[in-house]
């Protein structure tokens, strides 16, 4: 390429979080280029014997591509011109998570940036009224959390209150032995409130809404990576 | 300063096992891949096992695969490896060493500890 | 799997000689190519990475060069502490081999 060495280019990466068993995307940015074949684009991890995924000259070149990550990566081959070096991870595992390299050689120069992946589980959380309790009780259930989060319930009139004394969360390990269900009952509850079902770990934060009165019942539930500076 | 400590060497007999640590102080254990290598009397050395920082990779010498199993747990800074169906030709110093942090930028091997010897002997 | 062959086994010489020896991989290992020291009862010290870099405190009368599949280590004048054993070794993408070793000796 001519690169004499002293000449960098500005790499840009965002720190994300993958879901185990999904796909994720590792994001990274670069100045473009104006020739696809004078791109070179290669990611590492640290601590790893092989690469996770290089491109250059227009196509994959994955014959150092480490074990772990073959069949699993791919860069968005139509978005490189464009200056687009994320990372696809199909499937994402536990054992994804660590510190990545984006590295980029172009004619203009070469580039670096690293970015922090997590991995673990999270779902968004769905508040029902059990009505088959003897009192009036919510019910809130989230199907994919890891690690283990904290379950807080919250509630509009009752702002700054404490539930844990008639709360009662379970986790029951899915069949895949690595992810849980949440499963959080609150008691005693009254009507025309909103309460929140509040799980969070140290990757993401969810929460489910549900305003109970006399005619109606409506949901609501949001989910926000943590550390993530999207 | 880098220090690597290998233990749980010693006499075993053929068909046997035995379970090798290195205890690592002096770096970020984690971020660095691990290897074991080996030596038999008045022979070269063999590269035996490596493992990646976060431990979802192994990597073996078609002489031990599927007798030995590398392990690490980096909330100890130690690295592992259980040796199982254990023959005479398995006689040997086993070194551990640092491996790569960063494929194709970093040093490797540049940190070993003093050896842990393993006889194989009826 | 990558074999590595050292040239020569072993090699007899005098305080002062430059000494090459030479390793041959069996195909393409690119840059990714080591050389160990090794005195007896020792465990081995790294002197080359990546085919030609100086590994940090290595005096500079140890050099490495080649790529591709032929590589040689050269001390330029040889000294009483470098007799001893000396191992290439390849760590292209995720295997590593080592070759079978060349003694140095005093002539």
């Known amino acids: 390429f001519g690169i004499s060495g002293r000449h960098s280019i500005t790499v840009t990466t965002v720190a994300s979080a993958g879901n185990i068993g999904e796909d994720g995307i590792l994001s990274c940015t670069f100045e473009p280029d104006i020739k696809l074949s004078d791109i070179v684009i290669q990611w590492l991890k640290e601590g790893v014997l092989g690469l996770v995924h290089e491109f250059k000259e227009g196509k994959d070149e994955l014959s150092e591509q480490d074990e772990m990550f073959r069949g699993r990566t791919a860069v968005f081959a139509d978005q490189v011109i464009v200056g687009n070096a994320s990372l696809r991870l199909k499937n994402v595992q536990l054992t994804d998570a660590g510190t990545y390299k984006c590295y980029i050689i172009t004619s203009k120069g070469k580039g670096n940036a690293n970015l922090e992946y997590k991995t673990g589980a999270f779902s968004m959380p769905e508040v029902n009224v059990d009505y088959n309790a003897s009192s009036e009780t919510l019910r809130c259930e989230a199907p994919r959390w890891f690690p283990q989060p904290t379950v807080v319930w919250a509630s509009q009139v009752d702002q700054g209150a404490n539930f844990s004394e008639v709360s009662n969360t379970s986790f029951e390990l899915n069949s895949e032995n690595v992810t849980m269900k949440v499963v959080s009952v609150l008691y005693n509850v009254t009507i025309n409130n909103t309460y929140s079902c509040m799980i969070e770990n140290d990757i993401a934060k969810a929460t489910g809404d549900i305003k109970v009165t006399e005619s109606e019942i409506k949901r609501r539930s949001h989910l926000q990576l943590l550390n993530s500076k999207a | 300063e880098v220090q690597l400590l290998e233990s749980g060497g010693g006499l075993v007999q053929p068909g046997g096992s035995l379970r090798l640590s290195c205890a690592a102080s002096?770096?970020?254990?984690?971020?660095?891949?691990m290897s074991w290598v080996r030596q038999a009397p008045g022979k070269g050395l063999e590269w035996v096992s490596a493992?990646?920082?976060?431990?979802?990779?192994?990597y073996y010498a078609d002489s031990v695969k599927g007798r030995f199993t590398i392990s690490r747990d980096n909330s100890k800074n130690t690295l592992y490896l259980q040796m199982n169906s254990l023959r005479a030709e398995d006689t040997a110093v086993y070194y551990c060493?640092?491996?790569?942090?960063?494929?194709?930028?970093?040093?490797?091997?540049?940190?070993w500890g003093q050896g842990t010897l393993v006889t194989v002997s009826s | 799997d990558i074999q590595l062959t050292q040239s020569p086994s072993t090699l007899s010489a005098s305080v002062g000689d430059r000494v090459t020896i030479t390793c041959r991989a069996s195909?393409?290992?690119?840059?990714?190519l080591a050389w160990f020291q090794q005195k007896p009862g020792k465990a081995p010290k790294l002197l080359i990475y990546?085919?030609?870099s100086l590994e940090g405190g290595v005096p500079s009368r140890f050099s490495g060069s080649g790529s591709g599949t032929e590589f040689t280590l050269t001390i330029s004048s040889l000294q009483p502490d470098d007799f001893a054993t000396y191992y290439c070794?390849?760590?292209?993408?995720?295997?590593?081999?080592f070759g079978q070793g060349t003694k140095v000796e005093i002539k």
């Open positions: 990546k085919a030609s």
């Open positions: 002096g770096f970020t254990f984690s971020s660095y891949a």
């Open positions: 195909q393409s290992i690119r840059s990714w």
């Open positions: 070794q390849q760590y292209n993408s995720y295997s590593r081999t």
């Open positions: 060493a640092r491996d790569i942090q960063w494929y194709g930028e970093s040093t490797l091997f540049d940190y």
């Open positions: 493992i990646s920082g976060g431990g979802g990779s192994t």
